[in-house]
């Protein structure tokens, strides 16, 4: 096998099925961020999730090495027709990817959105949102994912995930 | 041009327009996998598809070198809506990315889903599903894509594709 | 910090909010391309967009170094539904990624599509389209993004973007 140089800087962390504790309280530190931060990612599920020269803390990937990172996330929204008064049939499903730097407020890097079907005949909805992009990050920067309608997220490890790798 | 080190480990394989033979029979070896495996990827269409230190066998990308791979696929679902006697055939369009290891059953790495529009006014549907993520793969691991509603897939080379590259 | 070898070849360019001048006229050089080319990308917004060993010219990323590139784009379609008598509200939202080589016509690399909700109850639509893939590019090749229904694009820098990086 050829020598591949220095060890990879990469992570792929996955949803954990238990929905409780998955999301931050609305008044947690990232109150300036839109949506609710996803907190309970899993990072050591054999063959599915890992951390390599990145740390995971409070749902945030913490950068150990400066560079350009391809950052991505997928969130899987799943819901059904439910009898609840005063609820709009339409749902806005938005996934945000933020970074924290030395600046106190989180900085929005990417957002991706879908709205659900408006029809009265709709019985359920399945909507996966994937987005990814390249960003320059510094040591100790932290990146996280937040979502609207967090109670709709399917946190199966194959369905909702978050990752990054150093490019170059 | 600067020296870029060892040769790339990468592939981007594309759909072939002929729909016949595109998908595995439901009773092929991957019967434990959800959906139907896409078999007939094209790997040497100049400027569009290629294999570099990865092999293609029976619709599966075969790993030659251990490491972290960013794996991705896009599948393009396209259909006319048929209203039959006031019934709506809602369609769940799901794309699965699996790996085979030494373990006999395929292991699901990622899944992404969409359902079609519920409105009775709907005439047709266009739904591209893209997903990608980082996974550690070993020599001789094989990865493949399977889908539900396989007859709806547009196998144009720009529309449906599958790829991977070694990160680091 | 470990030595990371040669400088990165990478770019992430982002939408600029002003919609004017954003898209090419339909009779610009890329008339053979489907959709309308997005022209006004921003490449030096601190922490959000950058160019590293790639150039930006007329909305096109210009390749300086031969190799396999992961190319990606996200476009965010957002609109109010207008109820007009006897008109169909359906919209086809398609994102195309093209390359120019020495060949005079642009070559389509990837396309991703969505159609909007057909329901008479629909009030608005939010649809992000992301796609990405690996392609071998040569020095002086140019890549660009074009879209249908360009007037619906939200050109916020977090919502619509275009990027590429050299793999290996």
């Amino acid at each position: 096998v050829r020598e591949r140089g220095p060890q990879r800087v990469a992570a792929h962390i996955t949803g954990t099925r238990g929905r409780s504790n998955t999301l931050s309280s609305p008044n947690s530190k990232n109150e300036k961020a839109l949506g609710r931060k996803i907190n309970s990612w899993e990072s050591s599920r054999s063959g599915h999730s890992f951390l390599s020269n990145l740390h995971l803390r409070n749902g945030e990937l913490v950068i150990q090495e400066k560079g350009f990172y391809y950052i991505y996330s997928q969130t899987y929204f799943r819901f059904q027709e439910e009898i609840k008064e005063n609820t709009k049939n339409d749902k806005q499903m938005v996934q945000y990817i933020y970074k924290y730097t030395s600046y106190p407020d989180p900085i929005l890097l990417m957002k991706s959105a879908r709205n659900s079907c408006w029809s009265k005949d709709a019985e359920y909805g399945l909507y996966s949102i994937y987005q990814g992009g390249l960003f320059e990050l510094k040591k100790d920067d932290r990146i996280f994912v937040s979502v609207t309608n967090e109670h709709l997220i399917d946190m199966d490890h194959e369905a909702s995930f978050f990752g990054a790798f150093l490019v170059g | 041009v600067r020296e870029r080190g060892p040769q790339r480990v990468a592939a981007h394989i594309t759909g072939t327009r002929g729909r016949s033979n595109t998908l595995s029979s439901p009773n092929s070896k991957n019967e434990k996998a959800l959906g139907r495996k896409i078999n007939s990827w094209e790997s040497s269409r100049s400027g569009h598809s290629f294999l570099s230190n990865l092999h293609l066998r029976n619709g599966e990308l075969v790993i030659q070198e251990k490491g972290f791979y960013y794996i991705y696929s896009q599948t393009y679902f396209r259909f006319q809506e048929e209203i039959k006697e006031n019934t709506k055939n809602d369609k769940q369009m799901v794309q699965y990315i699996y790996k085979y290891t030494s373990y006999p059953d395929p292991i699901l790495l990622m899944k992404s889903a969409r359902n079609s529009c519920w409105s009775k006014d709907a005439e047709y549907g266009l739904y591209s599903i893209y997903q990608g993520g980082l996974f550690e793969l070993k020599k001789d691991d094989r990865i493949f894509v399977s889908v539900t509603n396989e007859h709806l897939i547009d196998m144009d080379h720009e529309a449906s594709f599958f790829g991977a590259f070694l990160v680091g | 910090v470990r030595e990371r070898g040669p400088q990165r070849v990478a770019a992430h360019i982002t939408g600029t909010r002003g919609r004017s001048n954003t898209l090419s006229s339909p009779n610009s050089k890329n008339e053979k391309a489907l959709g309308r080319k997005i022209n006004s990308w921003e490449s030096s917004r601190s922490g959000h967009s950058f160019l590293s060993n790639l150039h930006l010219r007329n909305g096109e990323l210009v390749i300086q170094e031969k190799g396999f590139y992961y190319i990606y784009s996200q476009t965010y379609f957002r609109f109010q539904e207008e109820i007009k008598e006897n008109t169909k509200n359906d919209k086809q939202m398609v994102q195309y990624i093209y390359k120019y080589t020495s060949y005079p016509d642009p070559i389509l690399l990837m396309k991703s599509a969505r159609n909007s909700c057909w329901s008479k109850d629909a009030e608005y639509g939010l649809y992000s389209i992301y796609q990405g893939g690996l392609f071998e590019l040569k020095k002086d090749d140019r890549i660009f993004v074009s879209v249908t229904n360009e007037h619906l694009i939200d050109m916020d820098h977090e919502a619509s973007f275009f990027g590429a990086f050299l793999v290996g």
Epitope: K120, Y124 | N86, T87 | -
Partner: antibody, heavy 115, light 107 residues
Amino acid sequence: EVQLVESGGGLVQPGGSLRLSCAASGFTFSNYGMSWVRQAPGKRLEWVATISGGGSYTYYPDNLKGRFTISRDNAKNSLYLQMNSLRAEDTAVYYCAAPTAMDYWGQGTLVTVSS
Amino acid sequence: DIQLTQSPSFLSASVGDRVTITCRASQEISGFLSWLQQKPGKTIKRLIYAASTLDSGVPSRFSGSRSGTEYTLTISSLQPEDFATYYCLQYASYPRTFGGGTKVEIK
């Protein structure tokens, strides 16, 4: 509080017809799909029919298509099941359920098909 | 059509026991499965929907989980009022289908 009350069950001869009703209250009836489910004595639950919230779509199992018709009157908050050409094997307790995922159930109405 | 294979069909248990009922779907149902409880002379009650979401007012001893196409209802500590028949229901596609039922009786 969501309430579903079935009526219209009873004894009917083979080949006969019957119309069941379900009165709904406690929710915006017109927004939700509704279903009929039945259970023959000592048997499992069996889905009979569904009508979508807007009333655009109706669904039946193949074995009941053509004999049974589901309908709704949103102005009256009522769901109906018209059953024709009844057979002995249609004998069951018939339940209405709302919405299409069957969150809420009525108490059922017994239909007996016998000569 | 999607078949739901529910097991066991009969279960004898004591108060305080942990009880597990499984339902295997013949194809992908994307988590659109609920668990119902039926007692003689009572209205059918939904306990869990979307594979793992507890209906309001349902005791926390009931839980639902999923692994691929296999779905599980667990009662962590069986109570006297839990002796009943339990059904799984898939509502991912038509025709809607129910499992065969599991009757939980007192040992």
